[in-house]
Interface confidence: low
Amino acid sequence: SERCDDWGLDTMRQIQVFEDEPARIKCPLFEHFLKFNYSTAHSAGLTLIWYWTRQDRDLEEPINFRLPENRISKEKDVLWFRPTLLNDTGNYTCMLRNTTYCSKVAFPLEVVQKDSCFNSPMKLPVHKLYIEYGIQRITCPNVDGYFPSSVKPTITWYMGCYKIQNFNNVIPEGMNLSFLIAFISNNGNYTCVVTYPENGRTFHLTRTLTVKVVGSPKNAVPPVIHSPNDHVVYEKEPGEELLIPCTVYFSFLMDSRNEVWWTIDGKKPDDIPIDVTINESISHSRTEDETRTQILSIKKVTSEDLKRSYVCHARSAKGEVAKAATVKQKVPAPRYTVELACGFGAT
């Protein structure tokens, strides 16, 4: 009996394509699951087989490669739609096999509709531009392999619903869109429409991405701890609740991991035999600078706890900082009848 390595339904690859546009979908086996490529597999005598399950159906069926004008075809490890139809939505499986070896994976393909302003259920990639950073470009994505280099397509860029022409700081340059200087006002969805001829027909590729203007690395600083600080003393009596916020500002940094943590007497709170809870909240500015607050809480503080060292730490790609909170045991106010009277020598 032959072992078929069934990778199941690869939901990580939620492929979405626009209705009535060409789509080329590579078999994910060679991109994510196997260590060899299609050419190696093919030369080893392995065959790639495609089949699909229509939306809301359980029946696996072969793909009809004999449609008029070769609407669906396969070329090496690529499944082609020229163009897609709404009812092409379903789960597609590519299977690599010969008499002794078998490996397959399924993936969902969703054909979506768009309106005249390019709005659709499509999940959009996000491209981050640095604020006021000089010339930056975005490139029309995922158009490689649709037409040979000898074909010169026409490319039209839109911001939202509007064709980009005579914009102050945004200039279309073929497949690229150049931002001479990026401002918050440049946030939004940008669409390129690529039009190219093939075998006497004209095809359109629509690609939309979201531009988000973020803090510039020129302005980035190490984490800044706003709290605890030298101006606030946490003075508590035993039995009271101790609440210390650690509030840290992080400049936006591409791919930086921002971290905030507390230590108590130099140890992580989990390693201390006291009942500590820590709650975190995160907020972002318009340019994705981040403020993280971690509130350290001890419900019923003891006099021992009030002698401990509480230090807030923060780290980003720009550096690491730490700040200790000033924690004291409150000296109880004297009760006049006993303590004060004794102070005046009363008997």
Epitope: E2, R3, F33, A44
Partner: antibody, heavy 119, light 108 residues
């Protein structure tokens, strides 16, 4: 570096079941197959079956079908092999091994779990 | 199932000598999915060669694999004291995955 750590030795009565665990640490667990191989004392290696944790897809050698259950818990990076209706000839060291990628070789092995079946 | 036959059963050699181990398959091994393992007493097997001839990470270049179809060979160019062990071939191209019976390389 990925390591596979197996549960300790077991002594079982004929007719009972044994469940051996294999915990992966230090690397990606889900996308690789974890296979089970056994070795009777003084004998060679025998493949029992395997599972790809990310999909829960298990398969086993015909010889063990109906007696072996291979599962995986993605949350703890642990694979399990349960063998039922034990007989004395099931006395062996049971190894888990990571299948480097689809139809690739067993590149990382657990330390082995000795299972003794005796009345 | 694919039956793998290893020969010889035992190979008696001295350190520094060349060892040639054979593995014959009852039918063609799919896509050359053939591996070699070394097993020392009391230890788990260790991958030496996969895909017939590709050395696994950290394996010294005195170990080499060759062959295709149904006939495969593991060669150890100069035996070191730590190389005396049992060697298994395995095909991992079709189910059930199968191992050869092993070749013991012992000190002469």
């Amino acid at each position: 570096q990925v390591q596979l750590l197996q549960s300790g030795a077991e002594v079982k009565k004929p007719g009972s079941s044994v469940k051996v665990s294999c915990k992966a640490s230090g690397g990606t667990f889900n996308i690789y197959a974890i296979d089970w191989v056994r070795q009777a004392p003084g004998q060679g290696l025998e493949w029992m079956g395997g599972i790809i944790p990310i999909f829960g897809t298990a398969n086993s050698a015909q010889k063990f079908q109906g007696r072996v259950t291979i599962t995986a818990d993605k949350s703890t990076n642990t694979a399990y092999m349960e063998l039922s209706s034990l007989r004395s000839e099931d006395t062996a060291v049971y190894y888990c091994a990571r299948n480097g990628a689809t139809s690739d070789a067993f590149d990382i092995w657990g330390q082995g779990t000795m299972v003794t079946v005796s009345s | 199932e694919i039956v793998l036959t290893q020969s010889p059963g035992t190979l008696s050699l001295s350190p520094g000598e060349r060892a040639t181990l054979s593995c014959r398959a009852s039918q063609s091994v799919s896509s050359n999915y053939l591996a070699w393992f070394q097993q020392r007493p009391g230890q788990a097997p260790r991958l030496l060669i996969y895909g017939v001839s590709r050395r696994a990470t950290g394996i010294p270049d005195r170990f080499s694999g060759s062959g295709s179809g149904t006939d495969f060979t593991l060669t150890i160019s100069r035996l070191e004291p730590e190389d005396f062990a049992v060697y298994y071939c395995q095909q991992y191209g079709s189910s059930p995955l199968t191992f050869g019976g092993g070749t013991k390389v012992e000190i002469k």
